[in-house]
């Protein structure tokens, strides 16, 4: 808390300018009018204030707006945003995408801070859903943003927003998140033709069910190994050797290098060895010829 002291004669600030960098902390407190600061916030960013001086400016704004800053001030906070706590930000009502962009720009190149996370949360909750423009903006600043959301939060993403998602935005998503995003992507891209559809849906296939993988295997898609390895194990297991061969096309040759890893490892164990032998890849561990295969999941369903 800065002690209240009278402003020395002739030092009263008429505007926010470079002369203020020579003011001591107590002089800033005494000589800068909070209302003037609020109207000229856009100038603060261009002036090389020290962190201690920025603390004083923040304190003045806090006193002026105890219920939270108006958006006209928030939009021009610039580096002062880095001084805000999540508690400060929870008082804000940010509705403009331009404001959001301006503040994200301040934090650009850094990890997502608690302040930024709170800001985004406030913004998205205010909008009611993650629309395409917001998603575009957030993933541009934080490619991992989408995968930082819970499945529940992802359920508020409308299918139309999926068009803004780039493959790298899904790199860190886990299967539970892809389970939510895949049906939305399927809906978003449903009117595209075969090859174009596959290019768009490919990144989301970690959430695809068996039936959709079987359908894709009939379309000469030549899925690459990186995509295949991210498929749900339970979705891959029921696929036949012929279906996997059609699904992967020339990439089927990569199965040998991946025989130790899921889902390939578990899939091999479910196939007949003589079917695996038809691939000519030396994949071992299938069900020996002459053995009867019992589908226990089917048996459980019947009992």
């Amino acid at each position: 808390e800065v002690e209240k002291t009278a402003c020395p004669s002739g030092k009263k600030a008429r505007e926010i300018d470079e002369s203020l960098i020579f003011y001591k902390k107590w002089e800033l407190e005494a000589c800068v009018d909070a209302a003037l600061l609020a109207t000229q916030m856009d100038r603060v960013n261009a002036i090389p204030f020290t962190y201690e001086q920025l603390d004083v400016l923040k304190h003045k704004l806090d006193e002026l707006y105890p219920q939270g800053y108006p958006e006209s001030v928030i939009q021009h906070l610039g580096y002062l945003f880095l001084k805000m706590s999540p508690e400060d930000i929870r008082k804000w009502n940010v509705t403009s995408l331009e404001t959001l962009k301006a503040l994200l720009e301040v934090n650009k190149g850094h990890e997502m801070s608690p302040q930024v996370a709170t800001l985004i949360d406030r913004f998205v909750k205010g909008r009611g859903q993650l629309d395409k423009d917001t998603l575009d903006t957030l993933t541009a600043f934080y490619p991992g943003y989408l995968c930082s959301l819970s499945p529940e939060e992802l359920s508020s993403v409308p299918p139309s927003s999926i068009w803004a998602v780039r493959p790298q935005d899904l790199d860190t998503c886990d299967p539970r998140q892809l389970d939510v995003l895949y049906p939305k992507a399927r809906l978003a891209f449903q009117n595209m033709n075969g090859s174009e559809y596959f290019v768009k849906i490919q990144s989301f296939l970690g959430g695809a069910p068996t039936e959709d993988l079987k359908a894709l295997s009939q379309q000469n898609v030549s899925m690459d190994l990186a995509t295949f390895m991210k498929l749900r194990t339970d979705a891959v297991l029921p696929l036949t050797v012929a279906e996997v061969q059609k699904l992967l096309g020339p990439h089927v040759e990569g199965l040998k290098a991946e025989e130790r890893h899921r889902p390939v490892r578990d899939w091999i164990l479910r196939q007949r060895q003589d079917d695996l032998d038809t691939l000519g890849l030396g994949l071992q561990g299938g069900i020996p010829n002459g053995y009867l295969v019992l589908d226990l999941s089917m048996q459980e369903a019947l009992s």
Partner: antibody, heavy 121, light 107 residues
Amino acid sequence: EVHLQQSGPELVKPGASVRIPCKASGYTFTDYNMDWVKQSHGKSLEWIGDINPDNGGTIYTQKFKGKATLTVDKSSSTAYMELRSLTSEDTAVYYCARRLHYYGSSGLDYWGQGTTLTVSS
Amino acid sequence: DIQMTQSPASLSAYVGETVTITCRASGNIHNYLAWYQQKQGKSPQLLVYNAKTLADGVPSRFSGSGSGTQYSLKINSLQPEDFGSYYCQHFWSTVWTFGGGTKLEIK
């Protein structure tokens, strides 16, 4: 610590066979494939084949089919390579090497010290 | 089977220099590529796997790059201990061939 221990140098006569052991320690033997590599004096490396110790599944390069046989003894965590009908062309250093256990597993991360085989009458 | 063509076959450079070794595959190997270093009389050592991932303990002056059929290993600011032979190896399909090797000598 992962270690692959191979046997010392072998001197054998043409037409004979030899079995080279590679004893693994410091990791779960059945969790990683074992590859075998040949290096003739002053030459490049030549991949022979690969064995999955868990199920005994093998794969060989065409040149070594009928020449090399890869086996494992799970109880002693040892991989073996048998070379038969030996000729002077088989004189080389033979390495066993463990294959990486990551997705996109393109690499041999631990190597034995090599066994020098000399075929001479 | 996919063949690996490595170049140059030999190379001499000064300590502190930057060198690049390349490997061309006869078909697309989808980044399933490793690089090894071998010193005289020693076993090879893994440097890079998956075309660009540095193996544990490998200095950051080594880097792998490439895709499809063209791959390279770059060594920045060569150190005396970097001299030796370098080999690439692919892991696509079922025959995992090595390149012919590059002998890196000190000038």
